[in-house]
């Protein structure tokens, strides 16, 4: 099943997020992703846990997953590079870099997103945008078109309360509020964008969605700048 959903959001403006990627397994949407360089898409490591021998591809320039669109391009993956410290049973280091088989043709609907390199927490309350093709309600309806939602960043201390994530949120992770509006498993690997800059990647750990006591968890890309640079080099 696809990992992730946007809850309480709305359909995104078509092609207004040209960095948005759909990571696909055997032709079906699996996870979100974000184009960070001409030949590289950043996603979540857990996304490929169940991929085994399946064919992994990346769809760029898409709004609708099913409809033909002038800007849609499907790229094969040359290699998948999960973070070396990612593990199946934890949400830590949940990052994956996918090298496309060729450089993406950049244009109005396909552009890399600048990512945060300054390792500083985003101010609590900052409104950030998260987008994805994940399930849109608890009944499991999957959208065909890209959805998005604006979420305020939640401070780490609150997120780490016993009633919330009970100390699991390290300095390399960040949280966003989850009161009915939320990202969830199916949006894993997708971007959390604050002020036009990629700040976080949706983690793919299993958690309840849309419950304010269980905020959304995002991997802070700035904390992994050295690793990202070393892989892209």
């Amino acid at each position: 099943p696809p990992r992730g959903r946007i809850l309480g959001g709305r359909e995104a403006e078509a092609h207004a997020r040209p960095y948005m990627a759909s990571v696909q397994l055997n032709g079906a949407h699996l996870c979100g992703g974000v184009l960070v360089a001409e030949q590289w898409v950043l996603s979540a490591a857990h996304c490929l846990e169940d991929a085994a021998d399946g064919k992994v591809q990346v769809l760029l320039g898409a709004h609708s997953l099913s409809q033909p669109e002038p800007s849609k391009r499907l790229y094969d993956v040359l290699r998948a590079v999960p973070h070396p410290d990612s593990q199946p049973d934890t949400i830590d280091h949940d990052l994956l870099l996918l090298q496309l088989s060729e450089k993406a043709t950049l244009g109005p609907a396909v552009r890399p997103l600048p990512w945060q390199r300054v390792d500083r927490d985003v101010a609590p309350g900052t409104l950030c945008d998260v987008a994805g093709w994940g399930i849109v309600n608890h009944a499991g309806r999957r959208p065909d078109s890209l959805q998005h939602v604006l979420l305020p960043v939640l401070d780490r201390a609150t997120c780490n309360r016993r009633t919330h994530h009970d100390g699991a949120i390290t300095e390399r992770l960040m949280c966003a509020e989850s009161n009915r509006r939320d990202s969830c498993k199916g949006d894993s690997g997708g971007p959390l964008v604050c002020g036009g800059v990629l700040e976080g990647v949706v983690t793919s750990g299993s958690r309840v969605c849309g419950n304010r006591k269980k905020p959304g968890i995002y991997t802070r890309v700035a904390s992994y700048a050295a690793w990202i640079d070393s892989v892209l080099a």
Partner: antibody, heavy 118, light 107 residues
Framework: QVQLQQPGTELVKPGASVKLPCKAS????????MQWVKQRPGQGLEWIGE????????NYNQKFKGKATLTVDTSSTTAYMQLSSLTSEDSAVYYC???????????WGQGTTLTVSS | DIQMTQTTSSLSVSLGDRVTISCRAS??????LNWYQQKPDGTVKLLIY???RLHSGVPSRFSGSGSGTDYSLTISNLEPEDIATYYC?????????FGGGTKLEIK
């Protein structure tokens, strides 16, 4: 309404450079790419390159690298194409065109006729 | 570079005719094809994008079709204002390339 204004004619000497403007109005300039296209007298259309005014990322036709330089001035919502070391081969009509997410140019300027002559 | 060939450079037509203009790509361009109209005064307009999609404001007498390497533009009932040169253009692979154009001329 969307308008792309280009001067009608430019006359320059061989070896010189020229900077052709394309003044955009009626839309948010930084939200759309701009393409440039060449048409020699009696000939077809030839794609030169395209620029994203929001961050000046450019795709060039390799054939025009070193000949054409694309720039923008967002404050005046104007795109420019500079052509250098001009020869008679550069005499042509040059069009600017707004390039959109449908991967086509939906509005075109009237074109500037460049004449390179001593 | 992908070569786009419009074998018919000029076509003698009559008003009311059904006119079909062909375009062939040197390799499969998977429907990444647009059609433009250039009037005798130099004005250029987008007619069809993505092989068959009519651009807004373009009369429904214009239609596009094709796949793989072979594409066509059809004008179902030629009007006086359709006298122009028509160009196909691929955007499958950089650099984007145009066909040589097909000029419609009244018989």
């Amino acid at each position: 309404q969307v308008q792309l204004q280009q001067p009608g004619t430019e006359l320059v000497k061989p070896g010189a450079s020229v900077k052709l403007p394309c003044k955009a109005s009626g839309y948010t300039f930084t939200s759309y790419w701009m393409q440039w296209v060449k048409q020699r007298p009696g000939q077809g259309l030839e794609w030169i390159g395209e620029i994203d005014p929001s961050d000046t990322y450019i795709n060039y036709n390799q054939k025009f690298k070193g000949k054409a330089t694309l720039t923008v001035d967002t404050s005046s919502t104007t795109a420019y194409m500079q052509l250098s070391s001009l020869t008679s081969e550069d005499s042509a009509v040059y069009y600017c065109a707004r390039y959109t997410t449908i991967m086509a140019s939906d509005y075109w300027g009237q074109g500037t006729t460049l004449t390179v002559s001593s | 570079d992908i070569q786009m060939t419009q074998t018919t450079s000029s076509l003698s037509v009559s008003l009311g005719d059904r006119v079909t203009i062909s375009c062939r790509a040197s390799q499969d361009i998977t429907n990444y094809l647009n059609w433009y109209q250039q009037k005798p005064d130099g004005t250029v307009k987008l007619l069809i994008y993505f092989t068959s999609r009519l651009h807004s404001g373009v009369p429904s007498r214009f239609s596009g079709s094709g796949s793989g390497t072979d594409y066509s533009l059809t004008i179902s009932n030629l009007e006086p204002e359709d006298i122009a040169t028509y160009y196909c253009q691929q955007y499958s692979k950089l650099p984007w390339t145009f066909g040589g154009g097909t000029k419609l001329e009244i018989k």
